[in-house]
Interface confidence: low
């Protein structure tokens, strides 16, 4: 599995590097942190444990998607 | 087609060093884990370790103190030292493709290393 | 370690008839992300082993689709629908889920 890999980015296009997700059962992972009146950070990769999720703080916004097709 | 080329000496003495070495032809040499596995004479499989591009390795606890396993990335190469042997590490060595987590779906053709005084 | 146990040890098979090996981890095998981590070899006699599934139940390429592998958690089976002469072998069952990484003991097939 092929997935785009970064960490704490502000932009997509920052987001471009290509990680082989070479363990079974792995998906690409995407993280969305946005602080309140900052941009929003943007980590992806693989991941073992990838599991969907979203959850407002008073501060921000914390949101988590998962899949598993190359590049997605 | 990936192939793994293994090779190294075939005999030893007791308290030697095992020295072998793999070399990786075709896909991706950095995109995965690389072991090395070993099996006794008419006996099963044993899993010595693992190592990645980078380096990173993993060993069975059970030869942890005496197992080297190194990279040469330039050389798609992997290497394996087993310090002070002894007849019980008598075996067929197999370099393989694959690690925790992982199947090994490439293997090497396999070394006898016999220990004898 | 997670200690993994086959049955039988020696399997004699008529060609055309099915057969089956038993392979048991002394821990769970599945993972919270819903795979097993179980893969099953054949070692030919004079050769390496080759890959014949992993993930429990997935075949490897080029494996004939008369070999099938079932099971989760603790309890797993290999299936040869129908036994041909190239099956003969050792056949090992192992787990990439914990290090160090094992092997069940092996299981010989051989033809009557």
């Known amino acids: 599995l092929l997935c785009y890999s970064c960490k704490a980015q502000v932009s997509n296009e920052d987001c471009l590097q290509v990680e082989n997700c070479t363990q079974l059962g792995e998906q690409c992972w995407t993280a969305r942190i946005r602080a309140v009146g900052l941009l929003t950070v943007i980590s992806k990769g693989c991941s073992l444990n990838c599991v969907d999720d979203s959850q407002d703080y008073y501060v921000g916004k914390k949101n988590i998607t998962c899949c598993d097709t190359d590049l997605c | 087609q990936v192939q793994l080329q293994q090779w190294g000496a075939g005999l030893l003495k007791p308290s030697e060093t095992l020295s072998l070495t793999c070399a990786v032809y075709g896909g991706s040499f950095s995109g995965n884990y690389w072991s090395w596995i070993r099996q006794p004479p008419g006996k099963g499989l044993e899993w010595i370790g693992e190592?990645?591009?980078?380096?990173?390795?993993n060993y069975n606890p059970s030869l942890k103190s005496r197992v080297t396993i190194s990279v040469d990335t330039s050389k798609n190469q992997f290497s394996l030292k087993l310090s002070s042997v002894t007849a019980a590490d008598t075996a067929v060595y197999y370099c393989?493709?694959?690690?925790?987590?992982?199947?090994?779906?490439?293997w090497g053709q396999g070394t006898l290393v016999t220990v004898s005084s | 370690d997670i200690v993994m146990t086959q049955s039988p040890l020696s399997l004699p098979v008529t060609p055309g008839e099915p057969a089956s090996i038993s392979c048991r981890s002394s821990?769970?095998?599945?993972?919270?992300?819903?795979?097993?981590?179980l893969v099953w070899y054949l070692q030919k006699p004079g050769q390496s082993p080759q890959l014949l599934i992993y993930?429990?139940?997935i075949r490897a390429s080029g494996v004939p689709d008369r070999f099938s592998g079932s099971g989760s958690g603790t309890d797993f089976t290999l299936k040869i629908s129908r036994v041909e002469a190239e099956d003969v072998g050792v056949y090992y069952c192992?787990?990439?889920?914990?290090?160090?990484?094992?092997f069940g003991q092996g299981t010989r097939l051989e033809i009557k």
């Open positions: 190592i990645n591009h980078s380096g990173s390795t």
């Open positions: 192992m787990q990439p889920l914990q290090t160090p990484i094992t």
């Open positions: 821990q769970s095998l599945l993972h919270s992300n819903g795979y097993n981590y």
């Open positions: 993930l429990g139940s």
């Open positions: 393989a493709r694959g690690g925790s987590y992982n199947y090994f779906d490439y």
